[in-house]
């Protein structure tokens, strides 16, 4: 025969659990009903009656199975660095995160405490290793027969063109400058075909960086000469 | 206002080891570059280790590399430099540097007070 | 590595003079040098970055020229706050080399 289907509020067995979706309630000892996503227990259960739910109001809201009896409020909207990625809803919190151009530099359980701009290799350097949403560019200087002449998150330290007949030798920051004929371009970064001085660089390729977590709000502006901006976000 | 403030100096014996920290306040550290240098008494200047914002990226000098380890806790706004086989010629008041933030603006702006490591028996 | 020469290690000047140190590189560090300055005790102090552009707070009497693997600080005119040590410093590759420095004393 099927065992009885117990509804809630019950006793549990001596030593049992309440099942999925229900809680123990102390103050009754009974099982009942836990409220789902987006409500919140307006009225806690008796040894006779159910727990009662009543939807979460504006701007808060439940993500799981409960019985608090208050929903959690949503965090504040996001901030000019910050675009929001999931709206407040009765089920879910506001999450922001950092905008094109920004990684989080300090984050929080959901979303991100301190945005900050990207870092811009200089003319000279370019880009080691791409920032991520959670990590900074990584800059490196550019190798003999490799240039970079822009200030720039993303471009990366490319060869100089080769050239029959070379007007001026390129260098870090510039690219070679031919003669008339047409030139070409040097398919490997490292490959320095030109009559360009080629100095011994003991430890040019920069070690390779491991991954990272950096996460971002902005509430101090840099001081000292430029580096990096940060954007404010509220919590 | 900026502030670097070290700690964990003074004297060990040779091959010893050293657990050096830099406390940073009035700027939003988790988004700066950080480097150690240091100054044997009466002698120059020596840049000693380099840690990028967020941990990923380090460089050393070569006289302290696979001895010394720099690291950071952003949630904490510190620094560290641990040293181990520490040797006579790492006697040295060692700074917490901030900068360079590098390829972007190369240069050191701002320095801690340093601590003193002697390195004796 | 990248040898940094900075000259000279020394020099004798009274208040008023223009001083000129300079820093010469074993190759090309494209600008990325920084001076500093330190007086006996404390810590270095940010001057010049990107070898001609003064950092916060620093008296106009200081300069930075150059570019290449040659570079120079000149104090036009030397204040009794001046005297003190000087390093340059690349930022080139790893490692990053500070020159000897140069002890600026007083006549």
């Known amino acids: 025969l099927p065992a009885q289907v117990a509804f809630t509020p019950y006793a549990p067995e001596p030593g049992g659990t309440c099942r999925l979706r229900e809680y123990y309630d102390q103050t009754a000892q009974m099982c009942c009903s836990k409220c789902p996503p987006g409500q919140h227990a307006k009225v806690f259960c008796t040894k006779t009656s159910d727990t009662v739910c009543d939807s979460c109001e504006d701007s808060t809201y439940t993500q799981l199975w409960n019985w608090v009896p208050e929903c959690l409020s949503c965090g504040s909207r996001c901030s000019s660095d910050q675009v929001e990625t999931q709206a407040c809803t009765r089920e879910q919190n506001r999450i922001c995160t950092c905008r094109p151009g920004w990684y989080c530099a300090l984050s929080k359980q959901e979303g991100c405490r301190l945005c900050a701009q990207l870092r811009k290799c200089r003319p000279g350097f370019g880009v080691a290793r791409p920032g991520t949403e959670t990590s900074d560019v990584v800059c490196k200087p550019c190798a003999p027969g490799t240039f970079s002449n822009t200030t720039s998150s993303t471009d990366i330290c490319r060869p100089h063109q080769i050239c029959h007949v070379v007007a001026i030798p390129g260098n870090a920051s510039m690219d070679a400058v031919c003669t008339s004929t047409s030139p070409t371009r040097s398919m490997a970064p490292g490959a320095v075909h030109l009559p360009q001085p080629v100095s011994t660089r003991s430890q040019h390729t920069q070690p390779t960086p491991a991954p990272s977590t950096a996460p971002g709000t902005s509430f101090l502006l840099p001081v000292g000469p430029s580096p990096p901006a940060e954007g404010s976000t509220g919590d | 206002e900026v502030q670097l403030v070290e700690s964990g100096g003074g004297l060990v014996q040779p091959g010893g080891s050293l657990r050096l920290s830099c406390a940073a306040s009035?700027?939003?550290?988790?988004?700066?570059?950080l480097s150690w240098v240091r100054q044997a008494p009466g002698k120059g200047l020596e840049w000693v280790a380099y840690i990028n914002n967020g941990g990923i990226s380090t460089y050393y000098s070569d006289t302290v590399k696979g001895r010394f380890t720099i690291s950071r806790d952003n949630a904490k706004n510190t620094l560290y430099l641990q040293m181990n086989s520490l040797r006579a010629e790492d006697t040295a008041v060692y700074y917490c540097v901030r900068g360079p933030f590098y390829g972007s603006a190369n240069y050191f702006d701002y320095w801690g007070q340093g601590t003193l490591v002697t390195v004796s028996s | 590595d990248i040898q940094m020469t900075q000259s000279p290690s020394s020099l004798s000047a009274s208040v008023g003079d223009r001083v000129t140190i300079t820093c010469r590189t074993s190759e090309s560090i494209y600008s990325n040098l920084p001076w500093y300055q330190q007086k006996p005790g404390k810590a270095p102090k940010l001057l010049i970055y990107d070898a001609t552009k003064l950092a916060e707070g620093v008296p106009s009497r200081f300069s930075g020229s150059g570019s290449g693997t040659d570079y120079t600080l000149t104090i036009s005119s030397l204040q009794p706050e001046d005297f003190a040590t000087y390093y340059c410093q690349h930022f080139w590759v790893t490692p990053w080399t500070f020159g000897q420095g140069t002890k600026v004393e007083i006549k």
């Open positions: 009035g700027f939003a550290f988790s988004t700066y570059d």
